[in-house]
């Protein structure tokens, strides 16, 4: 079938890199500057993405290949082949329509991307507190009463001062 | 193609202004989130200001709040930054660039941003 088909179709002889030019007998052309295929036997070059403003070229354009973009310093890559650049942010923040906001109290962010999470309730495990939570650290789930020897006391520190935090929204 | 293309850049002394415009074609403008982002010399990209479909929620960053303005005519497929008491810490490339179609809690990427516009800030 390949071969019968190869007979028929003369385009189906062009290698990536190169389309099957209807203007000129069906030969196969180089694809143009700037342009690519990434399989044998189209018709036309694709476009190369561009990499420019908020994206930065990890990988040129070849012949036979697209461009890859990541994301300037600042920004990282979201979607797809980094569809799209979002603003960092530090740990202990996240991001919101007005740029980047502390995490409220009660909640943490160890990341530089992503939402602000609630510290783990340690009293649902039946544990204490080991180690006080903040902006950009979880708490430290410690033993439970009852796993500590007798005479041993809790090693629950008191619950922090409030802190001012920012609401999202 | 998607494509915006900025102007209106210059060299301008401090506490004077200037007005940025970005021209957008190839996509339906109105429908989409803009933002303004800069890059100062030898400094990673910042977010400056973004403003909703409608022009009804804009956002800034703290350092240019109350001094810069973000707006949009829908109708001319066009976003400007009016920027006013420029500082030497100015001093950048700004970029506009588009936004979601809409914003959820996470995510506020861009998806394309033009060539740039110079802005530079003297004494």
């Known amino acids: 079938f390949e071969r019968t088909r190869s007979l028929q179709d003369p385009c189906s002889n062009c290698p990536a890199g190169t389309f099957c030019d209807n203007n000129r007998n069906q030969i196969c052309s180089p694809c143009p500057p700037n342009s690519f295929s990434s399989a044998g036997g189209q018709r036309t070059c694709d476009i190369c993405r561009q990499c420019k403003g908020v994206f930065r070229t990890r990988k040129e354009c070849s012949s036979t290949s697209n461009a890859e973009c990541d994301c300037t310093p600042g920004f990282h890559c979201l979607g797809a082949g980094c569809s799209m650049c979002e603003q960092d942010c530090k740990q202990g923040q996240e991001l919101t329509k007005k740029g980047c906001k502390d995490c409220c109290f009660g909640t943490f962010n160890d990341q530089k991307r992503g939402i602000c999470r609630p510290w783990t309730n340690c009293s649902l495990d039946g544990k204490s507190v080991l180690v006080n939570g903040t902006k950009e650290r979880d708490v430290v789930c410690g033993p439970s009463p009852a796993d500590l020897s007798p005479g041993a006391s809790s090693v629950t520190p008191p619950a922090p001062a409030r802190e001012p935090g920012h609401s999202p929204q | 193609e998607v494509q915006l293309v900025e102007s209106g850049g210059g060299l301008v002394q401090i506490g004077g202004s200037l007005r940025l415009s970005c021209v957008a074609s190839?996509?339906?403008?109105?429908k989409y989130w803009m933002i303004w982002v800069r890059q100062a010399p030898e400094k990673g990209l910042e977010w400056?200001?973004?403003?909703?479909?409608?022009?009804?929620?804009?956002y800034y960053v703290d350092s240019v709040e109350g001094r810069f303005t973000i707006s949009r005519d829908n109708a001319n497929n066009s976003l400007y930054l009016q920027m006013n008491s420029l500082r030497a810490e100015d001093t950048a490339v700004y970029y506009c660039?588009?936004?979601?179609?809409?914003?959820?809690?996470?995510?506020?990427?861009?998806?394309?941003s033009g060539q740039g516009t110079t802005v530079t800030v003297s004494s």
């Open positions: 190839g996509f339906t403008f109105s």
């Open positions: 660039a588009r936004g979601g179609d809409d914003y959820s809690h996470s995510h506020y990427g861009m998806d394309v």
């Open positions: 400056v200001a973004n403003i909703n479909q409608d022009g009804s929620e804009k």
